[in-house]
């Protein structure tokens, strides 16, 4: 019985539960998903049952070995996996156990401008960038190309400062998880400071 | 890469016996069990046997008890299959094939084959 | 010994054709059936293995279906690749393991 093993996986993708085993005559092997049996092999026997027929398709097992592939993920096959190998030439059986996170695809994300202010010509706002459908695990960073140097900050909320008359910023917000990533659409300075840039001192959403 | 590679054909007198060699690569030899089908010309597939190179266990299917001796040597991840008493009716082709782990009757790699010709 | 009985022993087909290979186990084997093509001079190679279990590689439009004693192989809609014989294995508990006699797949 080895450490838990954390895997990954991405909604209507698969995922490989690894398993070896050097043991000569395993009478059965049981996969369990949160305490569900999921499948149960008896390899001599030339036998795999699925318990549940919808899992049916989805399950398969690379080049022949003890390895479950599970396909066709969804967001609730997150969750604890547990194998159980038995074997009459083993006292106890060997198990290994899995954590699976199953993660969407990211869409776009979406950026938001907080109140800005325009004094003596300088535009100062945040922006803020999240996901629309509160997906989980995401990180945030923040692109701003144009200067002399481009940089990089990390966090769902930029801080800007942009003077009038310098050279036009792009900023652009990178959404990651696990499995993908994903860009806002670019956002120029100058085009986010003109509404402001009438009254040098006004604030607007 | 899985690989089975078989000894050349092999042309012998009846009440000769053959040897025939079934040499193993890409995989933990010694962990999977090797069985020995063979074809008669023109017929289909027949199951002699197979062992467990582990351990040198090995099982014959009961027409070849006696004149089918099945081994393995692990230091070379080779496995053998000798046959006696040879006779007209044991010209085939000889396959060598690995088991699967999760169906262990089942087998996934097989070897080129090597045609045995008994012949007065 | 298990016998398994394999029908048709040939049958002519076309590029695009359904086909459908039947095996008959003379007793219950659950699942424990395996299918596999060969080509003239070639060995064979394995297709489906526990009744439904396409092995790796595989194209899906060979599918395995049954259990107890009836057994079907199915090629979805049959390629120039295809033409080649087809056998039947059980390998259901302890040995001896049997084939069925075969199903040559022929161009009509």
């Known amino acids: 019985s080895g450490p838990v093993k954390e895997l990954v996986g991405s909604v209507g993708g698969a995922v490989t539960f690894p398993l070896k085993s050097k043991v000569k005559q395993v009478d059965s092997i049981v996969w369990t998903f949160n305490t569900t049996p999921l499948v149960t092999i008896q390899p001599e026997g030339g036998t795999i049952i699925v318990t549940q027929n919808r899992n049916r398709e989805r399950v398969d097992f690379p080049d022949g070995g003890y390895s479950l592939k599970l396909s066709k993920l969804k967001k609730n096959d997150s969750g604890i996996y547990y194998v159980g190998i038995y074997s009459s030439s083993l006292q106890q059986p060997s198990t290994q156990e899995y954590v699976l996170h199953v993660y969407e695809h990211l869409s776009k994300p979406k950026v938001t401008m907080g109140l800005q202010s325009n004094k003596n010509g300088t535009c100062v706002t945040n922006l803020t960038c999240c996901m629309e459908h509160g997906e989980e695990d995401v990180i945030y960073t923040w692109k701003a190309l144009g200067q002399a140097a481009n940089e990089s900050h990390n966090g769902s909320i930029l801080p800007i400062s942009w003077r009038w008359g310098e050279s036009d910023m792009t900023f652009i917000c990178v959404a990651r998880n696990p499995v993908s990533r994903n860009f806002s659409s670019p956002i120029l300075a100058r085009k986010l400071c003109e509404g402001a840039a009438d009254d040098p001192d006004s604030s607007m959403v | 890469q899985v690989q089975l590679v078989q000894s050349g054909a092999e042309v012998k007198k009846p009440g000769a016996s053959v040897k025939v060699s079934c040499k193993a690569s890409?995989?933990?030899?010694?962990?999977?069990?090797m069985n020995w089908v063979r074809q008669a010309p023109g017929q289909g597939l027949e199951w002699m046997g197979r062992?467990?190179?582990?351990?040198?266990?090995?099982k014959y299917q009961g027409k070849f008890k006696g004149k089918v001796t099945l081994t393995a040597d692990k230091s070379t991840s080779t496995a053998y299959m000798e046959l006696s008493s040879l006779r007209s009716e044991d010209t085939a082709v000889y396959y060598c094939?690995?088991?699967?782990?999760?169906?262990?009757?089942?087998?996934?790699?097989w070897g080129q084959g090597t045609l045995v010709t008994v012949s007065s | 010994d298990i016998q398994m009985t394999q029908s048709p022993s040939s049958l002519s087909a076309s590029v695009g054709d359904r086909v459908t290979i039947t095996c008959k186990a003379s007793?219950?084997?659950?699942?424990?059936v395996a299918w596999y093509q060969q080509k003239p001079g070639k060995a064979p190679k394995l297709l489906i293995y526990?009744?439904?279990y396409r092995y790796t590689g595989v194209p899906s439009r060979f599918s395995g279906s049954g259990s107890g004693t009836d057994f079907t192989l199915t090629i979805s809609s049959l390629q120039p690749e295809d033409f080649a014989t087809y056998y039947c294995?059980?390998?259901?508990?302890?040995?001896?393991?049997?084939f069925g006699g075969g199903t040559k797949v022929e161009i009509k």
């Open positions: 007793q219950d084997v659950s699942t424990a």
């Open positions: 094939a690995r088991s699967t782990m999760i169906a262990t009757g089942a087998m996934d790699y």
């Open positions: 890409g995989y933990t030899f010694s962990s999977s069990w």
């Open positions: 526990s009744a439904s």
């Open positions: 062992i467990y190179p582990g351990d040198a266990d090995a």
């Open positions: 294995q059980q390998h259901y508990s302890t040995p001896p393991y049997t």
